[in-house]
């Protein structure tokens, strides 16, 4: 053996934004024939861990929502941890509007700006387009959020949409906005 | 209430062997992961070896795998330590542990600890 | 040696307050490992006294209070009392080898 046994992959079924009251499974990729995998929820002062390749949650809840890594344990050497997996609760706040200026409709070579607005004073606010697993913006801390997209081409067309939470409990993120279609005109 | 009871130490030559018992009462033994910690004589604590409610977790410290081997038998609330090849540095107040669980969850801290049990490794 | 480090020995005067440090590193305290207190009076068995860097067991008075920062922790002790002579360890676990870790411990004496 030498170094450490590479680190795994850990994985969020169907999804890492999971709606409150919806199921997810948390699974750690690595070898099949790995001795014991630890799969670790990572919080300051509770740190807790459980002796599983994967997480079932059938309902998810507020105390689900955190921080998550795993890690394999091969002939007694441990494998380097995982990409830590951020699994987030939505739904806990009622949803943020968005809305394009100067429209929703735009032709190429212009600007637009997607504007997420929400009725708390979140300090957080990101921007997902449909098919992306990624947020597609994640502005400064505004608490009005304005994304601005510089010199639409057709790819950005498509439907989007906006959350918004808290950076006091980031994991804890609201309802998504109604969705907002973009077309690139022409 | 969580009661553990280490037992099986004594005087042992260098290179022979030992096995230690530790006897859980006032809990649900094979829910949690369970380890031992030993002190050498006026020195600090050192954890040895840990293993999972079921048996099947097992994990040691550099210093004696390959020598030591832990075990459970969950039917007589019961955790063992066998400890083979001793030496001289494996003098010391062996402890058992019990780590603190919740629901499904495990956490890296020690609740309840024995009495300790006195293994002196000695020609 | 200890993988976490501790002072060997405090002292304080009754009522006094005093702090145990307790260093780490980036694989195990600055890994996101929480650091739990144990302490030991003389010829007993270790218990429980701080969880989860800052949790006090029931039973456990409140001038024991913990607390972390980056790759190390701290105990503090305030209203010092005869009792609280003993040895105190802190423990925390390690992400290299995903084993159990411990200071070496801190003698406290309450003088006078």
């Known amino acids: 053996q030498h170094g450490p046994l590479p680190k795994p992959s850990l994985q969020a079924q169907p999804s890492s934004l999971v709606p409150l009251g919806h199921p997810v499974t948390l699974r750690c990729l690595g070898p099949s024939d790995a001795d014991l995998y630890r799969l670790e929820k990572v919080k300051p002062g509770k740190l807790i861990f459980i002796d599983q390749d994967f997480l079932f949650i059938p309902i998810m809840e507020i105390n689900n929502a955190g921080r998550y890594r795993c890690s394999y344990q091969n002939e007694s050497h441990w494998s380097l941890p995982s990409d830590q997996l951020e699994l987030i609760a939505t739904g806990v706040y009622s949803k943020p509007s968005l809305s394009a200026h100067p429209s929703s409709a735009i032709p190429p070579g212009r600007d637009v700006t997607l504007k997420c607005q929400s009725q708390y004073s979140f300090d957080e606010f990101v921007l997902y387009k449909e098919g992306d697993t990624r947020p597609y913006k994640r502005p400064e801390k505004w608490y009005r959020a304005n994304f601005p997209v510089i010199t639409v081409t057709a790819a950005h067309s498509g439907t989007y949409r906006c959350y918004s939470f808290s950076s006091s409990s980031p994991y804890l993120w609201s309802a998504p906005s109604d969705p907002l279609v973009v077309v690139v005109t022409g | 209430q969580v009661q553990l009871v280490e037992s099986g130490g004594g005087l042992v030559k260098p290179g022979g062997s030992l096995r230690l018992s530790c006897a859980a009462s006032?809990?649900?033994?094979?829910?949690?992961?369970v380890s031992w910690i030993r002190q050498a004589p006026g020195k600090g604590l050192e954890w040895v070896s840990a293993?999972?409610?079921?048996?099947?977790?097992?994990q040691y410290a550099e210093s004696v795998k390959g020598r030591f081997t832990i075990s459970r038998d969950n039917a007589k609330n019961s955790l063992y330590l066998q400890m083979n090849s001793l030496r001289a540095e494996d003098t010391a107040v062996y402890y058992c542990?019990?780590?603190?669980?919740?629901?499904?969850?495990?956490?890296?801290?020690?609740?309840?600890w024995g009495q300790g049990t006195l293994v002196t490794v000695s020609s | 040696q200890s993988v976490l480090t501790q002072p060997p020995s405090v002292s304080g005067a009754p009522g006094q307050r005093v702090t145990i440090s307790c260093t780490g590193s980036?694989?195990?305290?600055?890994?996101?490992?929480?650091v739990h207190w144990y302490q030991q009076l003389p010829g007993t068995a270790p218990k429980l006294l701080i969880y989860?860097?800052?949790n006090r067991p029931s039973g456990v008075p409140d001038r024991f209070s913990g607390s972390k920062s980056g790759t190390s922790a701290s105990l503090a002790i305030t209203g010092l009392q005869a009792e609280d002579e003993a040895d105190y360890y802190c423990?925390?676990?390690?992400?290299?080898?995903?084993?159990?870790?411990f200071g070496g411990g801190t003698k406290l004496t309450v003088l006078g």
């Open positions: 293993i999972g409610g079921s048996g099947s977790a097992v």
């Open positions: 989860g860097n800052s």
């Open positions: 423990q925390s676990h390690d992400l290299g080898a995903h084993v159990w870790v």
């Open positions: 980036s694989s195990n305290i600055g890994a996101g490992y929480d």
């Open positions: 006032g809990f649900s033994f094979g829910d949690y992961y």
């Open positions: 542990a019990r780590h603190y669980r919740e629901f499904r969850w495990h956490y890296y801290y020690f609740d309840y």
